[in-house]
């Protein structure tokens, strides 16, 4: 996250960190006790079974008692994910256990299925453990920045026509650099307490106003998300699972 600030620890309890070989790699967010949403491109060249998902974290390198760590039992990328264009850049991670909900671990609500994205100018927040500058500086803890929704046609023009309708864009609202950076991928764009966007890609420089930040528009995938979650719930399974609605 560039141009942002460190959040109050555990004030974004839905945040998940996906790590490989002990290093944070991508973000994600908890929507169900067994499921985290992340970006499909995070797993294009990584074996999901080698990854770990950490919930309840603030400073990832600190051994916080609130942290819950899971391996990835299954990673379900959207069947129409296109690495060449990053279209349909969304992935569901099934945890190998059930998250224990509490003050530091909570679910994030999804938008209504096929809901219109927030109007241009709407203030939203994106958070993550990604770099805080183009120098690839790691953050001291979970970071967040306020951004504004940008009209998709304006954004598509800035991106030389590369976007599709299931994407969402934000900008700083001024000329300053504010937005996400490398390793924020998969994290949520929260508008009105719902995950309307999922961090997908940005331009040459983090927060560059000329190439606005691009997100997967979550509302376009809500049906798919719950279809996957439902399909994986075995009829004979016991124990209560909770989902955000």
């Amino acid at each position: 996250i560039v141009g942002g600030h460190e959040v109050t620890p555990h004030s974004r309890p839905y945040m998940a960190s996906v790590s490989f070989e002990g290093h944070h790699y991508c973000g994600g967010f908890l929507i169900h006790t067994h499921w985290v949403v992340s970006a499909a491109h995070c797993f294009s060249d990584r074996d999901p079974s080698m990854g770990l998902v950490v919930l309840g974290a603030h400073a990832l390198l600190a051994p916080e008692p609130t942290q819950q760590t899971f391996s990835i039992a299954a990673a379900v990328s959207h069947p129409d994910f296109q690495p060449a264009t990053q279209a349909n850049d969304i992935c569901l991670l099934r945890l190998n256990g059930s998250a224990v909900l509490g003050p530091a671990v909570r679910l994030l609500r999804l938008p209504r299925r096929n809901a219109k994205p927030p109007a241009a100018g709407t203030r939203c927040h994106v958070s993550g453990w990604g770099f805080v500058s183009d120098f690839e500086e790691p953050p001291p803890g979970l970071m967040e920045v306020e951004v504004r929704i940008l009209d998709l046609s304006v954004c598509n023009s800035s991106w030389q026509g590369q976007l599709n309708p299931a994407m969402l864009c934000t900008h700083s609202g001024d000329r300053r650099r504010r937005g996400f950076c490398s390793a924020d991928s998969g994290g949520p764009l929260v508008c009105g307490r719902r995950a309307h966007g999922l961090v997908s890609f940005s331009g040459l420089w983090c927060g560059d106003p000329k190439t606005p930040d691009v997100y997967t528009q979550v509302s376009a995938f809500v049906t798919w998300i719950w279809d996957v979650v439902r399909a994986s719930s075995s009829p004979g399974s016991t124990g209560r699972s909770v989902r955000a609605v």
Epitope: Q86, D134, F135, E136, S182, L204
Partner: antibody, heavy 119, light 107 residues
Framework: EVQLVESGGGLVQPGGSLRLSCAAS????????IHWVRQAPGKGLEWVAW????????YYADSVKGRFTISADTSKNTAYLQMNSLRAEDTAVYYC????????????WGQGTLVTVSS | DIQMTQSPSSLSASVGDRVTITCRAS??????VAWYQQKPGKAPKLLIY???FLYSGVPSRFSGSGSGTDFTLTISSLQPEDFATYYC?????????FGQGTKVEIK
């Protein structure tokens, strides 16, 4: 040792096409953005195009937009520049360059390949 | 696009001289400026990034300074191998743009 080696340059008539290649070694291709920068004879440097580390995103200079296409094959550690509808003003040495950090600067450059557009 | 204007376009200097090249951006680019050295028939080489950070392996006689719109590359004591053309480049906003170059020649 980091190396970038361009190939594919040559003489082409106006309106023709060429495909340049940039073979990378000594670094993780998928961890760094790749750029093409050109230099017309006796002139300065002009940035042409960029492809993101994932290969999923691209951006072009206005002067080549719609005519040039940058792509990458991460399995081959190679980037490409497909140049169509070539014009005389595209005559230049074309360099591929690797990003330092998150595109802060270009820290490694290839030796360049000359593209001449002439009838 | 942001214009980067270098001055002078060329200069003559002797070995041991202190040489200063300036670069002015058409708008604020913070400290997102790099400097390159290029010799005839060769690819550019990175000297300085983020206005003042010396790139690995570059001799300490090279230094950079500035922020906002005005930037400077200084060679504290010119060496025979330093005769070349120098370019500044902004990496603040898309597209990246270069200065027109400053040719440093032997007096």
């Amino acid at each position: 040792e980091v190396q970038l080696v361009e190939s594919g340059g040559g003489l082409v008539q106006p309106g023709g096409s060429l495909r340049l290649s940039c073979a990378a070694s000594g670094f993780t291709f998928s961890g760094s953005g790749i750029h093409w920068v050109r230099q017309a004879p006796g002139k300065g440097l002009e940035w042409v195009a960029w492809i993101s580390p994932t290969g999923g995103n691209t951006y072009y200079a206005d002067s080549v937009k719609g005519r040039f296409t940058i792509s990458a094959d991460t399995s081959k550690n190679t980037a490409y520049l497909q140049m169509n509808s070539l014009r005389a003003e595209d005559t230049a040495v074309y360099y591929c360059a690797k990003s330092l950090f998150h595109n802060v600067a270009f820290d490694y450059w290839g030796q360049g390949t000359l593209v001449t557009v002439s009838s | 696009d942001i214009q980067m204007t270098q001055s002078p376009s060329s200069l003559s200097a002797s070995v041991g001289d202190r040489v200063t090249i300036t670069c002015r951006a058409s708008q604020d680019v913070s400290t997102a400026v790099a400097w390159y050295q290029q010799k005839p028939g060769k690819a550019p080489k990175l000297l300085i990034y983020s206005a003042s950070f010396l790139y690995s392996g570059v001799p300490s006689r090279f230094s950079g300074s500035g922020s906002g719109t005005d930037f400077t590359l200084t060679i504290s004591s010119l060496q025979p191998e330093d005769f070349a053309t120098y370019y500044c480049q902004q990496s603040y906003t898309t597209p990246p743009t270069f200065g027109q170059g400053t040719k440093v020649e032997i007096k």
